[in-house]
Interface confidence: low
């Protein structure tokens, strides 16, 4: 009964009924990706074209819950995966110590209000080391050339900008520290030991509506999707788990 609101469900989630009206948002993902056995990979999804508020993001593999990033409670990593899954960056997920068995479909499930649920799909193929290395041989020279070119261009741009702004005594504050600040408690949370609000979200190219006023901080504004929709008190029965 993933909750009778699709309620209880989610795993977790598990989904509240969608509000009426069109779901205009779209999920952009990294698509089909490959990685080397034993290595790491970052799974990333991005919700755009909607002003809906993101309240929780679930990461799942096939039918297994990997992790949940809840706006209020932060990250929860499923006990079965906590040794090999790390939260972030942002709303993404990092898979470590990859094995061939990790090959398969991964889903990012965005719980939003009032739109409901958006799901993105990523297919990961974990390659044997020799295969990955073979592909890398062809990429390294090209990447090296591109990097060298970029360094030259960037240096020139920096010099020009520096000379242009030299006369201005304006002090420009960098927001980089805010954007990259890792908030405390990016570990699994439970009812008994919640991590700080919004610890899972950093405003790194965050879509509109995700972090309220886009302050470059954690997204504590994400309200619990379930509470808002009376999901956790609530909406669909299967919500207790999550809807399909």
């Amino acid at each position: 009964m993933r909750w009778c609101l699709l309620l209880i469900w989610a795993q977790g989630l598990r989904q509240a009924p969608l509000a009426s009206g069109m779901m205009t948002g779209t999920i952009e993902t990294t698509g089909n990706i490959s990685a080397e056995k034993g290595g790491s990979i970052i799974l990333q999804c991005h919700l755009s074209s909607t002003t809906a508020q993101v309240t929780q993001v679930n990461w799942e593999q096939q039918d297994q819950l990997l992790a949940i990033c809840n706006a209020d409670l932060g990250w929860h990593i499923s006990p079965s995966f906590k040794d090999r899954v790390a939260p972030g960056p942002g709303l993404g997920l990092t898979l470590q110590s990859l094995t061939v068995n990790d090959t398969g479909e991964y889903f990012c499930i965005y719980h939003t209000y009032p739109d409901g649920t958006y799901t993105g799909r990523i297919f990961l193929e974990v390659l044997e080391s020799s295969v990955a290395e073979h592909g890398a041989r062809f990429q390294i020279p090209l990447l090296g050339a591109m990097a060298a070119t970029l360094v030259v261009i960037c240096t020139a741009v920096i010099v020009v900008v520096a000379l242009t702004r030299k006369k201005k005594a304006l002090r420009i504050h960098s927001v980089e520290g805010d954007l990259r600040r890792k908030s405390a408690g990016q570990e699994e949370w439970s009812p008994s030991a919640p991590s700080p609000p919004g610890s899972c979200v950093q405003a790194e190219a965050a879509p509109a509506g995700l972090c309220g006023e886009q302050r470059g901080e954690d997204c504590a504004e994400l309200h619990d999707y379930f509470n808002v929709l009376s999901y956790r008190s609530l909406g669909n029965c299967s919500f207790f788990t999550e809807t399909g």
Epitope: R14, M23, E60, F240, T241, T243
Partner: antibody, heavy 121, light 112 residues
Framework: EVQLVESGGGLVQPGRSLRLSCAAS????????MHWVRQAPGKGLEWVSG????????GYADSVKGRFTISRDNAKNSLYLQMNSLRAEDTALYYC??????????????WGQGTTVTVSS | DIVMTQSPLSLPVTPGEPASISCRSS???????????LDWYLQKPGQSPQLLIY???NRASGVPDRFSGSGSGTDFTLKISRVEAEDVGVYYC?????????FGQGTKLEIK
């Protein structure tokens, strides 16, 4: 083996309280939503309450709202149902149940054997 | 609240013959994600209920393929292609779309 074992049922007078417990084993308890479903003698099934894996989402049937409280202790792999202000119509066999999935909805795939609650003066 | 109505309430069947149970909801159980949030459960005499079908038409693990679920929106059907003696019991449909979840009254299947 996946198992749910209910306890705490018994005979109680109207207006009194009772606390049901459900001990879960054989699966990762804190990955799944749980529910209580009851069945009055000779009657059909009635969903009573549900709770998400992280206790954030909670739902109740109208007939028990304000009187019953569902909770869980993931560290103890346990589900609870605190029943206050009991009425004769709460007399039933109470089942502890588990959601079948944690991404999509897969129905309620595991049911305990139930514990009997009798409310009578 | 969503009200679930089953018919018939009693269903005598000859072993080997097909059986069909209808379940109707007071409002659509079709979620915008394309799934119908309707399950079927069987409670055999003296036992706890067991899941047969979830999301309208998906057979639960271990359920014989003679059981099938169909329908969408407000009208659903559970079919047993060839009834066996072990299929005796009360069949319930349950909506999982909105809280509170709700069950039908149950259909008692008995062998003629």
């Amino acid at each position: 083996e996946v198992q749910l074992v209910e306890s705490g049922g018994g005979l109680v007078q109207p207006g009194r309280s009772l606390r049901l417990s459900c001990a879960a084993s054989g699966f990762t308890f804190d990955d799944y939503a749980m529910h209580w479903v009851r069945q009055a003698p000779g009657k059909g099934l009635e969903w009573v309450s549900g709770i998400s894996w992280n206790s954030i989402t909670i739902g109740y049937a109208d007939s028990v709202k304000g009187r019953f409280t569902i909770s869980r202790d993931n560290a103890k792999n346990s589900l609870y149902l605190q029943m206050n202000s009991l009425r004769a119509e709460d007399t039933a066999l109470y089942y502890c149940t588990k959601d079948g999935g944690n991404r999509r909805y897969y129905g309620v795939d595991v049911w305990g054997q139930g514990t009997t609650v009798t409310v009578s003066s | 609240d969503i009200v679930m109505t089953q018919s018939p309430l009693s269903l005598p069947v000859t072993p080997g013959e097909p059986a069909s149970i209808s379940c109707r909801s007071s409002q659509s159980l079709l979620h915008s994600n394309g799934y119908n949030y309707l399950d079927w459960y069987l409670q055999k005499p003296g036992q706890s209920p067991q899941l047969l079908i979830y999301l309208g038409s998906n057979r639960a693990s271990g359920v014989p393929d003679r059981f099938s679920g169909s329908g969408s929106g407000t009208d659903f059907t559970l079919k047993i292609s060839r009834v066996e003696a072990e299929d005796v019991g009360v069949y319930y449909c349950m909506q999982a779309l909105q809280t509170p979840c709700s069950f039908g009254q149950g259909t008692k299947l008995e062998i003629k």
